[in-house]
């Protein structure tokens, strides 16, 4: 039960006080008691409950005609059962007794009022009155947790605007309102109560730039909303009529959790006594609601795909046809960014990551725009953000970034349990250097901080700086599986490729050619690849780098070897000992449910079939996956990327609700 104020009573004159329903009010009967009195008794109106405890040990007893010793160990508390119809209509009488004096009476006139700030603290999608049931001032995680949730209103419901909805202090329409959380102020007071009292709604100065509150004013034709709290307004005096009244507020978050903002916002209503015009207003009561801003959540490859994105560039029609066919098979919407909009930047995966935010009443896809800002710079803002599609970005928008700030370097695992700790939304994975040096690359700290601050997908740093491009999607992917943990981790594996090529040579296929059928590309015989000492040394180094990540992933995702599939792949070390795929990098695949779009490796054709494709199919088809090999050689591979790099996917949000987890 909420804490009320302390009321001091005195025999000299009657005391007038306000008692808010659902609060426990302390009664100080000792400090002004007549000097010779040693005991007291209390009588109260039927609407007042008095509790007297004498401790220690506490002996609790409701009022009757009993007398109680007048000493500091006695605690008297009041609660009120009903709101008053008129000011001071509830009475408490204290009688003081002494051995030689007649009883002395002190009178207390109470006004019971109902004031409660309600939000969806039970996370059902509905605002229910919670007076005297739950403490709204704490926010707790887990299935038995409580606390209201706010969405960052980061979509753009007004298509004529270029800004996010939370960047203005207007409510566009009911669509805009649905992105906000409802909070209701319920009051029940005597009619004249607010001639001497005022209600003020307020937010801490440290949080005022993170939230905006609109007050709905009900008119005859429509509801209008006006801003009452926000970056410019930490407090607002409310005009409340006496009697029974409900006032609706709509609350939007303006910022995602981040290093400097844990994501909690407290809105408080204060009841002030303004009866004495010559004195400052006095606080009578406060009620608060704590909201947590919904985190931005990534979706892994195991979530069903809903929309595929790719770019149209010079001469990639065949690639787009393959992606279109795959999207149709997976029953996905397809969005193509035309040449005039992508400015020859085909790397859709690098520009953005599509996740979502969720409150009990609303789920919203949100695009996280990387700071790489090349040709696709405008695409997330102009073409992805829109009605019910949010937008967020982090990091410097001009310079100061590296290749590791592109979102091919940002992935998320499927849900895992690691040494008994559950990650029901998976864990974020991004690449880094293994130690900082003058020229090592790392994901920008602002991006790392943002990802960590979301709390629900605890990030894992992998080692990717050994790669020329430096992205984790160059050596790993996840595919859905019907057994075990519900997925497999795919890792690029030079060892597996050398083993396959050695087997083919042993069977007399040493003359078979890699890159056969590719015009203007020097073909390589299996035997030459196997005998090239430098290439073998390079791949031995690459294997060590991938193995480092393999052990890291096993430890941080709780994986066993049987959860991992090795995809045959060779790399070569280029300038500054940075690795690039030697042939199209098959692990850099597009995963659309059970349909996989895999870079066509152009491996040695043996008995009419590419041995690399055959090997990959033999590894993945038993999991119910269908492999489509897509020729991306000249349009993507030679430009240092593959199918995954050139595409992006919006996926279905998790059915698991983030607030039910314990980070």
């Amino acid at each position: 039960m909420a804490q009320g104020t302390l009321i001091r009573v005195t025999p000299e004159q009657p005391t007038h006080a306000v008692c808010v329903l659902g609060t426990l009010t302390q009664l100080d009967i000792c400090s002004s008691a007549p000097e010779d009195c040693t005991s007291f008794s209390i009588n109260a109106s039927p609407g007042v409950v008095v509790d007297i405890a004498h401790g220690p040990p506490a002996k609790k007893k409701s009022t009757g005609s009993s007398t109680w010793p007048l000493d500091p160990g006695v605690e008297v508390t009041l609660t009120m059962k009903v709101a008053s119809g008129s000011t001071g209509d509830q009475k408490v009488q204290i009688s003081y007794y002494g051995p030689k004096t007649p009883p002395v009476k002190a009178l207390l006139y109470l006004t019971g009022v109902e004031i409660s700030l309600c939000a969806d603290i039970t996370r059902t999608g509905k605002v229910k009155p919670t007076r005297a049931v739950k403490d709204q001032r704490t926010w707790t995680w887990g299935p038995c947790g409580q606390g209201a949730i706010l969405l960052v209103n980061c979509d753009r419901d007004n298509l004529e605007s270029s800004a996010m909805d939370c960047e203005d202090d207007e409510v566009l329409d009911s669509e805009d309102l649905q992105d906000m959380s409802l909070m209701t102020l319920s009051t029940k007071t005597p009619k004249d109560f607010f001639t001497n009292h005022t209600l003020v709604l307020h937010v801490a100065r440290s949080e005022m730039d993170k939230v905006r509150v609109f007050q709905a004013t009900r008119g005859k034709l429509s509801s209008k909303c006006s801003v009452v709290l926000g970056p410019k307004w930490p407090s607002h005096y409310l005009m409340v009529p006496g009697g029974k009244h409900n006032m609706d507020f709509y609350v939007e978050a303006l910022a995602f959790p981040d290093t400097d903002f844990p994501g909690l916002i407290t809105l408080t209503i204060s009841l002030l006594d303004t009866s004495n015009l010559e004195l400052p207003e006095a606080v009578v009561f406060q009620d608060s609601v704590v909201f947590r801003v919904a985190p931005w959540i990534m979706t892994p490859n195991t979530q069903p795909p809903q929309e595929v994105y790719a770019c149209s560039i010079f001469e990639n029609e065949d690639f787009l046809k393959s992606v279109t066919t795959l999207a149709m098979k997976a029953k996905c919407k397809l969005t193509i960014c035309p040449e005039e909009e992508n400015m020859d930047d085909q790397w859709m995966q690098d520009e953005m990551e599509i996740g979502y935010i969720q409150a009990p009443h609303k789920t919203l896809p949100v695009v996280f725009d990387s700071p790489r800002n090349r040709g696709l710079k405008e695409f997330p803002i102009k073409r992805v953000m829109g009605p019910d599609f949010g937008y967020v970005t982090r990091g410097p928008q001009t310079g100061g970034i590296s290749g590791l700030d592109s979102f091919g370097n940002l992935e998320v695992s499927p849900p895992v349990t690691v040494r008994g700790k559950e990650y029901p939304l998976g864990r974020i994975l991004f690449g880094d250097s293994c130690y900082p040096s003058n020229d090592s690359r790392q994901m920008h700290q602002a991006l790392q901080d943002f990802l960590s601050a979301q709390q629900v997908q605890a990030p894992v740093k992998l080692y990717s700086d050994w790669l020329s491009v430096g992205h984790v999607d160059e050596f790993l992917s996840f595919v859905p599986a019907p057994d075990r943990k519900g997925f497999r981790l795919l890792l690029a594996s030079p060892r597996s490729c050398y083993k396959l090529f050695q087997e083919q040579q042993n069977e007399g296929h040493g003359e078979a050619l890699l890159f056969e059928g590719i015009k203007k590309k020097k073909q390589q015989k299996i035997k030459n690849i196997l005998s090239n000492k430098t290439l073998r040394e390079h791949n031995s180094f690459v294997e060590r780098c991938i193995d480092w990540n393999r052990e890291l992933l096993k430890r941080e995702l709780g994986l066993a070897e049987s959860d991992i599939i090795d995809i045959p792949q060779l790399f070569k070390l280029k300038e500054f000992s940075k690795a690039e795929a030697f042939f199209p990098n098959m692990v850099n695949m597009l995963v659309l449910g059970k349909h996989l779009g895999i870079p066509k490796p152009f491996g040695p054709v043996i008995n009419g079939r590419c041995c690399l494709e055959e090997k990959v199919c033999s590894l993945l088809e038993p999991l119910g996956l269908q492999c489509t090999f897509i020729n991306d050689f000249f349009t993507y591979h030679i430009r240092h990327g593959e199918v995954h790099c050139g595409t992006n996917v919006r996926r279905k949000p998790f059915s698991f609700k983030w607030w039910n987890m314990v980070p």
């Epitope: 290749g403 020329s468 020097k522 030679i638």
Partner: antibody
Framework: QVQLVESGGGLVKPGGSLRLSCAAS????????VSWIRQAPGKGLEWVSF????????YYADSVRGRFTISRDNAKNTVYLQMNSLRAEDTAVYYC?????????????????????WGRGTLVTVSS | QSALTQPRSVSGSPGQSVTISCTGT?????????VSWYQQHPGKAPKLIIY???ERPSGVPDRFSGSKSGNTASLTISGLQAEDEADYYC???????????FGGGTKLTVL
Amino acid sequence: QVQLVESGGGLVKPGGSLRLSCAASGSTLSDYFVSWIRQAPGKGLEWVSFINSANTFTYYADSVRGRFTISRDNAKNTVYLQMNSLRAEDTAVYYCSSANDDVDDIVAPGRGYYMDVWGRGTLVTVSS
Amino acid sequence: QSALTQPRSVSGSPGQSVTISCTGTRGDVGRYNHVSWYQQHPGKAPKLIIYNVYERPSGVPDRFSGSKSGNTASLTISGLQAEDEADYYCSSHSRSSTPVLFGGGTKLTVL
């Protein structure tokens, strides 16, 4: 074969900034590694910075690290050198140079470490 | 002071051969086969004449040859001609924090 033209040099006070550009013609610069090399008046060559063809990593000489930034805009066929906190000892002719990133090699040929095409240079003078 | 050491000057008569040395350490010339040589005429941009220790770009006469032994690389110019008079610079990839190093340059005079 690619041709390179540097621009953006000039006189600047110590502590000031300049942005050099290296524009390519005759070929697509996205197929090339690019380096900046400088030569102080009457002195030898000094390697300054490097950016790979994929625009994914960069390297710098100790003498300029933290002050200079190399970048490229493949759509504009141009590489840039942003020079901040300039000092008198940065006075030099700045050359842009490149080497083709040939994807056909079975193993790395070291093209990022040599410069087979050079521009004519642009003079940067840092003086109060 | 340059990281790679070259003689300040060498000279030779037309038709003769000259060799210019370039001495580094185990962390650059000694470790990598990424040694290159450049020719620079006064007021002009440098021109690549040798890369990867001994390879010649197309258009460079075979009078120019490169080699390496231990931590020292060498450029040999045989059958000296008047137009060979220029400054010559060696360069190497390095393990140091500056990944490409140049020599201080050698002035070749054709007598």
